[in-house]
Amino acid sequence: AGYVFRDKVMSEFNNNFRQQMENYPKNNHTASILDRMQADFKCCGAANYTDWEKIPSMSKNRVPDSCCINVTVGCGINFNEKAIHKEGCVEKIGGWLRKNV
């Protein structure tokens, strides 16, 4: 039962994270939560950083600045892969949840 619950939590978290990405950066509250998660967990996107390409409100050469290894204003514009966290947040935060929930 515990494993089923854990998988359900992961699935919900994945869906919720992707939903929040769709609202980025239009919704300030959503943006600040996603930025905080990406910066704190050193991750970018749901599965990986390329998820941000699919977000209509984000230009194709951009990830949120919170994805950058060294966060500065505008660092996510025309980003270089070596300058950003490439790992996805669902897996990274999911690992933390599995240990702590």
């Epitope: 390329t50 514009i77 025309n78 270089n80 892969e81």
Partner: antibody
Framework: QVQLVESGGGLVKPGGSLRLSCAVS????????MNWIRQAPGKGLEWVSY????????YYADSVKGRFTISRDNAKNSLYLQMNGLRADDTAVYYC????????????WGQGTLVTVSS | DIQMTQSPSSLSASVGDRVTITCRAS??????LNWYQQKPGKAPRLLIY???NLQSGVPSRFSGGGSGTDFTLTISSLQPADFATYYC??????????FGQGTRLEIN
Amino acid sequence: QVQLVESGGGLVKPGGSLRLSCAVSGFTYTDYFMNWIRQAPGKGLEWVSYISNSGAIKYYADSVKGRFTISRDNAKNSLYLQMNGLRADDTAVYYCVRDPRSYYGFDYWGQGTLVTVSS
Amino acid sequence: DIQMTQSPSSLSASVGDRVTITCRASQSISNFLNWYQQKPGKAPRLLIYGASNLQSGVPSRFSGGGSGTDFTLTISSLQPADFATYYCQQSFSNPPVTFGQGTRLEIN
């Protein structure tokens, strides 16, 4: 020193194919995005395509989408452009170009290779 | 796509002159603007990146300015080696990278 050397250009008939190669040396290849940029005779510069460090991201100009394919081999320090369905307006010098990204500009260019599409 | 418009298209000047080329973007591009010099039969060479930063090895007589939509490239005292074609280029919205149409600098 940084070197980018293109090859594979030449004369081809409309509808034909060519594969351009670019051999790079003198820098850590995987630290950079790479681009193909072309220049028709007597004309300005036109961006064609780029590929990310790992090859995960690829984009193309509308004028070549569906006909050209960019790829890279990080083990061989090489960049490629497969060009199919070539048209007369693809005639140009094709440059292999290093891209540090952010606001740094295209800092190193190859010498270029001429592609001529004519019957 | 962001359009880049250079002016003038061509320019005649003499050695020692101060020359300014302008580049206008169709929308704000912050400082994501670069300048290149190209001589006949050669590949372009990066002069200025990030609107105002001098690329390593480029003479200090070249300078860049501007932000947002309006940018300038200035050559403080023209030298014989400076007669060439100059292009501006934006990388703020990429793809596609877009270039200006070029400014041909000729000897008067």
